[in-house]
Structures are given as C-alpha cells and as structure tokens.
C-alpha cells in the first residue's frame, strides 16, 4: 500500500508512517516503528506538557518568584503550568503575571478615572476634547485646557490630549 501523506488526529507522520502522539503529561521517548508503538514517559515532578505532542522534553513549571511579589495561585500538574498571582494589594503587569506592581500608571493622553485599591488596579480613561494629561500618573485626572479668553489672550497653538493650549497676546492690528 501507498505510504500515508497525512495522519489522523493525535497522530504524526514519521518515516512514512503514522505514529500516535504522546498524551498531555507525557513526553516522547521513541517513535513508533512497523512493529512497536510510540513510547512515551510521564513528565517529571516540576514539569508539564499540556497538549498531545511529540516533544522529547517537558516544559518546566513557571516559578512564582517572591522577590517579584509573586505567589502560587494554582500549583502545576504534569498537564498544566503553574499559575502565579501577586501578593495581596499588588497587581499583575500582564495576563501572564510575570511581575507585580503596586498599581499601574495612566500614560500621557489618559487620566485616572479610579485610583487603585487593594483589589482593583488603576482605571484609566482617555482625555476627551478640551482636556489633556502630559504625565504618566496613578492619581492625576485629565486637566482642562487653559482658557485663553479668560486671560484676555488668544489661542496660539491648539491643545491635544497630551498638551495644553498655548495662549498668546491678541493681535492689536484689527480693522
């Protein structure tokens, strides 16, 4: 018979034949042959593989480094990675939670809508037209543009969400 060019789900093609993949939690020791099945071995104590695979090495469980404010939220198994979270009152810097911050800052162009608490991080909002923020801050709201008119001045440079308007003297040469 013709050698296969594609294999079924949970199989892989090698040496013109279809071998079974190793199940999650196990790594590949040797490919199957005409006469033998794929040989797989369970991952070690601090290792995992989370898919049907042909990997020869298991992945190391993530380390939740206490020096970065991390602690274990869920211990890893042979099929799942460890899930880290931050110490109480701290917040993950990313979905992967690789480090912790007390709270995040709102970038220029954004203001603080709600200051962080022990359970929720800073909530930022974009500065609407007429407001700006030129700093990175964890407490400052968007500031309103300066009103040149109230100072008997005129707008020389328009404001943006990151910059205030620039006021200047009125042109006295009016018809």
């Amino acid at each position: 018979p013709e050698p296969p060019t594609a294999c079924r789900e949970k199989q892989y093609l090698i040496n013109s034949q279809c071998c079974s993949l190793c199940q999650p939690g196990q790594k590949l020791v040797s490919d199957c042959t005409e006469f033998t099945e794929t040989e797989c071995l369970p991952c070690g104590e601090s290792e995992f593989l989370d898919t049907w695979n042909r990997e020869t090495h298991c992945h190391q469980h993530k380390y939740c480094d206490p020096n970065l404010g991390l602690r274990v939220q869920q211990k890893g198994t042979s099929e799942t990675d460890t899930i880290c979270t931050c110490e109480e009152g701290w917040h993950c810097t990313s979905e992967a939670c690789e480090s912790c911050v007390l709270h995040r800052s709102c970038s220029p162009g954004f203001g603080v809508k709600q200051i962080a608490t022990g359970v929720s991080d800073t909530i930022c909002e974009p500065c609407p037209v007429g407001f700006f923020s030129n700093v990175s801050s964890a407490f400052e709201k968007c500031h309103p543009w300066t009103s040149c008119e109230t100072k008997d001045l005129v707008v020389q440079q328009a404001g943006t969400n990151k910059t205030d308007v620039v006021c200047g003297p009125q042109d006295r040469l009016r018809a």
Partner: nanobody
C-alpha cells in the same frame, strides 16, 4: 540600583505628630511621581498619599485628608509625610513607592505606632 529608605517612624500618643522621610537614591528623583502607602497589622495595603513629579499636584486618601501633608525636596532627593492629629488607626508600616511601582523597588518601611 534604585533604593528607597523610609525613616521617622516611632511610638506616639493619639493627637501627636510625626514626620516621615523617604531618601531616594539610584535614580533621578526629580520628576518622578511618588506615593506613601501603609500596611496596618493583619490588613492589606492602603494608598495614603501621592505627589506629582513637579510637586504641583497631590492626592490624599479620605482617611488622612486634613491631617497629613505630602511634600518633596528634589534638592535632597527626599519625600516627606507630615502626620498630625494621629489616631490609633494610623498605626501601620509606612512605605514610599516610585513609578513604575514594581515590587523590587519596595523599601523596608518605617513603623508608626499610635498608642497611649
């Protein structure tokens, strides 16, 4: 290496005053927003007060408004917290923090105990 060293804590009677200092080194202090945060025994972190990099804007938690004042002296690379009319509930370890507020910038804190 960024270092924040808090000092000025101690035992004080209710109604008394203390001034905390936070000496900063390893970075250009001027221009950085700074915070005071506290942790009471067995409680979570509470954000107490903040000051903008320019010193022009400040924030105070409702629990300390009118009693605490945050200031900075950029020439001395130092942040201050003047605490007046102290109450038993102000008892905590006080920490200063700088942007980006990462855990590895955390100081040892200074303990404030308000008790008669």
């Amino acid at each position: 290496e960024v270092q924040l060293l808090e000092s000025g804590g101690g035992l004080v009677q209710p109604g008394g005053s203390l001034r905390l200092s936070c000496a900063a080194s390893g970075f250009t202090f001027a221009g950085y927003e700074m915070w005071w945060v506290r942790q009471a025994p067995g409680k979570g972190l509470e954000r107490v007060s903040a000051i903008s990099g320019s010193g022009g804007s400040t924030y105070y938690a409702d629990s300390v408004k009118g009693r605490f004042t945050i200031t900075r002296d950029d020439s001395k690379n130092t942040l201050y917290l003047q605490m007046n009319s102290l109450r038993a509930e102000d008892t905590a370890v006080y920490y200063c923090a700088k942007e980006p507020y990462s855990f590895d910038y955390w100081g040892q804190g200074t303990l404030v105990t308000v008790s008669s």
